[in-house]
């Protein structure tokens, strides 16, 4: 039987007695930024060309004897996981291996920056396929790693990142919080966080998906048909970074973008128990399980979004908080999140040429998210158009006027502290679905977007009693782009997107009285694009 | 049931080149490794190498680099041992045998295919 | 490359009694990865291929006679015939797997005394 980490990443249409997926990877090449290894190992033996690359610190201690077969262990296993003919994701990549970890594992930022610019130059020098760098490391914080990376990316190298073994917030350590580089947790067999010791999975915001990454069994440097169990995010990225060539293999003109929607699109779901994380952490934390796509062609009619928390911004009055999208994603709405509450919502706003959502804290406030809904959408016409606080007791209202724009999100900022605290909620009139509605003493701000054959409508539910927890769902076909909260509801901490439900999230229940106060309304915007299923008809 | 069927014994002369086979049943053959054994009249067990199916990679003994070749046909689940030019020393039987990553070990043996090369 | 050298030659053996085959390999072929010895026992009949009766040293192939065991560990290793059958004469291989070239032992022939 197949090993349980290739079964768990294989969609049942792949699964017979073996794990076979059509084309291996064979046109993408991996880079492995790690220990040395053991190229002659029958798993990877003419599938991994050694550098000629080393940049390693020397070990530590006197006592510290070199032996080859330890020194080889990490990166090896780690090459198999990748791409080895028997246990590997990938089995047609081909790989090529840099040395920047020591016998003991470890590296410096610099022997690492010096291998990225090895490999950006090899890249000039000879161009071939799509490239995946695999960074199966972590170190503490490092903005000059973090902008070695974001320049590999812009240069159209995929980065796939461990998030880090700290059982920590990943956004603590590099490579894993370089926004542009896919940062991968691990699970086990049973999609839960996995334990190392005392310590276990980094965790947060930074980390795009988890991946397989206990018990997973590879090349051991210990003999060339040996094979061991080995465990940790490095095992998880080398996953990720196996199913992205796959991925690339069948679709070599991916972007990064394209590629990291399509990695989060096709995982699994909520299959991960949040109790293992920090309570803080969990609403950060994506609940997706990396796994390849069910079919190598056809993903591309989809509109695919994705959900970007920004960092906390810190309890000061006036402290913000802005989340972006990437550079070839477009910002589709905008929210944001205060577990005490206190927060004066949040805005879209232009900054150096593209939209970002920023949220504001309010005065007593332990601060405050920006939550960014950032979706792939070719050909899109964006604007956000504002209106300011109304001064008729019906509230704000603002629509999206301009010919064949749609609405694709709702924000809502405010200046006074405590808005709504006493105030009914505002309803939104019946067969206006295209606007957006706020309270009068607030800012709204709509998104709206033109793009070849996009739609979209509103769907809501509400609750009239008070209840911590009101969700939304688009329907099979259709992606969510836009969530809020209809105001009046003034016990809400806030609103953002997990996969393609809209989640609006209140105090504790016990707190708050179940007058109409307690009514809390999800408003969910799903948008299709007849377009790109069009499109996708015709390329078939 | 899992067999390796190899075919038949063959008499050629020195100089001649020669294709022998080893056909998979009962098995994933893309999932197992396909190794050819020699063993010349009274004499022992020697790895010639190995080939797996589903790449058609290979490895070769040093001792017999260069002078045979290994290859597979994975769509009919066959490998094969070839010479482009028999000598009279490679006159001996020639076992096909399989193994897999989780069991390195031959736990499956062709029949054997016998050559004979005489002038 | 792993050489492999058994002892003896060759046995004689009376019916119903234990026969005992050494083999020692140039180096350990016991890794700590798994705890586990790459080595395998075969036994050849006259005119027929090997057939596999013990691997990783000591675990019996399924449905080879429980007569068969095996032992050792690192480099040097045993197979016993608790009780030698008339359909035990036959030559055996140990054969090392861990390593490329793979490697056999020159052979020891069992007969019955």
């Known amino acids: 039987s197949i090993p349980w980490n290739l079964e768990r990443i294989t969609p049942p249409r792949y699964r017979a007695d073996e794990y076979q997926p059509p084309d291996g990877g064979s046109l993408v090449e991996v880079y492995l930024l790690d220990t040395s290894i053991q190229s002659d190992h029958r798993e990877i033996e003419g599938r991994v060309m050694v550098t000629d690359f080393e940049n390693v610190p020397e070990e530590d201690g006197t006592r510290f004897h070199r032996q080859a077969s330890k020194c080889d262990s990490h990166g090896t296993h780690l090459a198999g996981v990748v791409s080895g003919r028997d246990a590997g994701v990938a089995k047609g990549a081909s790989m090529r291996s840099l040395r920047v970890l020591n016998c003991q594992g470890k590296g410096t930022v610099s022997g690492t920056l010096i291998g990225l610019e090895f490999i950006r130059k090899s890249q000039l020098v000879q161009p071939v396929g799509p490239l995946v760098v695999l960074l199966p490391l972590a170190g503490g914080y490092s903005r000059v790693l973090n902008a070695a990376c974001q320049r590999l990316a812009r240069a159209g190298v995929v980065l796939v990142t461990a998030a880090g073994n700290f059982r920590d917030d990943a956004c603590l350590y590099s490579p894993a919080s370089a926004p542009e580089v896919i940062t991968v947790g691990a699970t086990n067999a049973q999609d839960q966080p996995v334990t190392l010791g005392t310590l276990g999975t980094n965790f947060g915001r930074c980390v795009d998906l988890f991946a397989p990454g206990e018990d997973i069994i590879g090349a051991s440097s210990d003999c060339s048909t040996c094979f061991v169990s080995q465990s940790g995010t490095s095992q998880a990225a080398a996953h990720v970074a196996g199913i992205a060539a796959m991925m690339l293999s069948a679709e070599p003109e991916l972007t990064l973008a394209e590629l990291r929607q399509r990695l989060i699109h096709f995982s699994a779901k909520d299959v991960i128990n949040e109790a293992w994380f920090p309570e803080d952490q969990r609403v950060l934390t994506p609940n997706l399980v990396a796994a390849l796509p069910p079919s190598t062609h056809g993903a591309g009619w989809q509109l695919f979004c994705r959900t970007v928390w920004s960092a906390h911004s810190g309890p000061t009055r006036m402290a913000t908080a802005v989340a972006r999208c990437a550079p070839d994603e477009e910002l589709l709405s905008c929210s944001s999140f205060s577990r005490s509450g206190k927060r004066r919502g949040e805005r879209m706003e232009a900054q150096g040429g593209k939209l970002v959502c920023r949220a504001h804290n309010a005065f007593g406030g332990e601060g405050v998210y920006a939550i960014a809904r950032c979706c792939l959408l070719p050909q899109a016409n964006c604007s956000v158009h504002t209106a300011p606080p109304a001064e008729a007791s019906m509230g704000t209202r603002v629509h999206c006027h301009q010919q064949g724009h749609v609405l694709t999100g709702c924000s809502s900022h405010w200046e006074v502290e405590d808005l709504g605290t006493h105030k009914p909620p505002v309803l939104r009139p019946r067969g206006q679905p295209n606007q957006c509605v706020g309270h009068r003493e607030a800012s709204i701000h709509a998104s709206c977007c033109h793009a070849p054959g996009l739609e979209c409508k509103v769907k809501e539910h509400g609750i009239p009693a008070p209840q911590e927890q009101v969700t939304v769902a688009c329907e099979e076909g259709w992606t969510l782009t836009g969530c809020s909260a209809l105001p009046g509801t003034s016990h809400v901490l806030g609103a953002y997107a997990v996969d393609n439900t809209c989640v609006v999230r209140s105090r504790d229940v016990s707190t708050t009285g179940s007058t109409s106060e307690g009514a809390v309304t999800a408003v969910a915007i799903c948008c299709r694009s007849r377009h790109l299923a069009q499109a996708s008809q015709e390329l078939q | 049931q899992v067999q390796l069927v190899q075919s038949g014994a063959e008499v050629k002369k020195p100089g001649e080149s020669l294709k022998i086979s080893c056909k998979g049943s009962g098995y994933s053959f893309t999932d197992y490794y396909i190794s050819w054994v020699r063993q010349m009249p009274g004499k022992g067990l020697e790895w010639m190498g190995w080939i797996y199916p589903g790449d058609s990679y290979t490895h070769y003994s040093p001792s017999f680099q260069g002078q045979v070749t290994i290859s597979a046909d994975k769509s009919i689940s066959t490998a094969y041992l070839q010479w482009s030019s028999l000598k009279a020393s490679d006159t001996a039987m020639y076992y096909c045998?399989?193994?897999?990553?989780?069991?390195?070990?031959?736990?499956?043996w062709g029949q054997g295919t016998l050559v004979t090369v005489s002038s | 490359d792993i050489v492999m050298t058994q002892s003896p030659d060759s046995l004689a053996v009376s019916l119903g009694e234990r026969a005992t085959i050494n083999c020692r390999s140039s180096q350990s072929v016991l890794y700590s990865s798994n705890n586990k010895n790459y080595l395998a026992w075969y036994q050849q009949k006259p005119g027929q291929p090997p057939k596999l009766l013990i691997y990783w040293a000591s675990t019996r192939e399924s449905g080879v006679p429980d007569r068969f065991s095996g032992s050792g560990s690192g480099t040097d290793f045993t197979l016993t015939i608790s009780s030698l059958q008339a359909e035990d004469v036959a030559v055996y291989y140990c054969q090392q797997y861990s390593s490329f070239p793979i490697t056999f032992g020159q052979g020891t022939k069992v007969e019955i005394k």
């Open positions: 045998a399989r193994d897999h990553w989780s069991k390195p070990y031959f736990d499956v």
